[in-house]
Interface confidence: low
């Protein structure tokens, strides 16, 4: 078990949204996590979440295989060998057409408070 306190994630940003994919960026202290666990859940359905793990050195990933014009909740956790951070979530609506790309809302995490930033 770790002796020190593992810091939480900083912020998560949906950087790009397409009709069937999106790009997720996040911040985290360097070297704090072995990997990140990402769940992509279609909102308002009982469909199983899509799960993805990415190495702890990454701060960005593409999330393919989504449906167009659909609300998703994306949750990310930083994971060490014996610790998982508080989950950080962002909601996003995928684009309705192939060329409909926009920058989505940005959500920051500050000690249990969500701050919403619209661009």
């Amino acid at each position: 078990a770790s002796t020190g306190e593992t810091p939480n994630l900083g912020e998560v940003v949906v950087a790009e949204v397409g009709w069937d994919a999106l790009k997720l960026n996040w911040t985290a202290p360097e070297g704090a996590y072995e990997y990140f666990f990402i769940q992509v859940q279609e909102a308002d359905t009982v469909e199983a979440a899509q799960n993805l793990t990415v190495p702890g050195g990454l701060r960005s990933t593409d999330l393919p295989g989504l449906k167009a014009a659909t609300h998703y909740t994306i949750t990310i956790r930083g994971v060490t060998q014996d610790f998982s951070t508080t989950p950080l979530s962002v909601e996003v609506l995928t684009a309705s057409g192939l060329n409909d790309i926009f920058e989505a809302q940005k959500i920051e995490w500050h000690e249990g408070t969500h701050h919403h930033h619209h661009h």
Epitope: A49, N51, V54, S84
Partner: antibody
């Protein structure tokens, strides 16, 4: 010291299912991924899938998708692998392995003793 | 899936020999590669992780190298207990894939 203890050998009929257990002791169970790896007689090692008990969600190799179910019971620190629609080519030693590193498909640093599953009519 | 091509598939060597086994990945996997030793009827045992880091308790005669697509496991001076089958494992991209194994036999 981490130990993974698997259930005993099984003999199954083609078309049936088998469920193998893997009980972990030592270390934290929930946050470590447990993978299942199989080895057919005289063959190499093959990753089947894995689970991180804290999340309860499993990940499977394409080859086994739809036929394998991996679960974990945090209360007993036990992971399970169930393989259905068994055929003769599923005859193998099945290992559970605890991972170090990147979740489901990290480098395996602790292994169970293996469970021999024989599929024969 | 990433293909891991391991060579040679078998080799004969004598105690004291220097032995090198190679693993080639079909695409770049950074340094996300481990090496395992397996003896008949036993579970595999990890020797090397992250391409070149020695697993705790493993003798220093074992060493790993490489990154990207080309990796090596070297046994600097083969000992009687080293006769076994060795596997590489890539864990950079899912699904994890093993090389087909290299059997090290006594000459």
């Amino acid at each position: 010291q981490v130990q993974l203890v698997q259930s005993g050998a099984e003999v199954k009929k083609p078309g049936s299912s088998v469920k193998v257990s893997c009980k972990a002791s030592g270390g934290t169970f929930s946050s470590y991924a447990i993978s299942w790896v199989r080895q057919a007689p005289g063959q190499g090692l093959e990753w089947m899938g894995g689970i991180i008990p804290i999340f309860g969600t499993a990940n499977y190799a394409q080859k086994f998708q739809g036929r394998v179910t991996i679960t974990a019971d945090k209360s007993t620190s036990t992971a399970y692998m169930e393989l259905s629609s068994l055929r003769s080519e599923d005859t193998a030693v099945y290992y559970c392995a605890r991972l170090y590193g990147y979740a489901y498909y990290g480098a395996f640093d602790y292994w169970g003793q293996g469970t021999t599953v024989t599929v024969s009519s | 899936d990433i293909q891991m091509t391991q060579s040679p598939s078998s080799l004969s060597a004598s105690v004291g020999d220097r032995v090198t086994i190679t693993c080639r990945a079909s695409q770049g996997i950074r340094n996300d590669l481990g090496w395992y030793q397996q003896k008949p009827g036993k579970a595999p045992k990890r020797l090397i992780y992250a391409a070149s880091s020695l697993q705790s308790g493993v003798p220093s005669r074992f060493s790993g190298g490489g990154s990207g697509t080309e990796f090596t496991l070297t046994i600097s001076s083969l000992q009687p207990e080293d006769f076994a089958t060795y596997y590489c494992l890539q864990n950079g991209l899912q699904p994890a894939t093993f090389g087909q194994g290299t059997k090290v036999e006594i000459k």
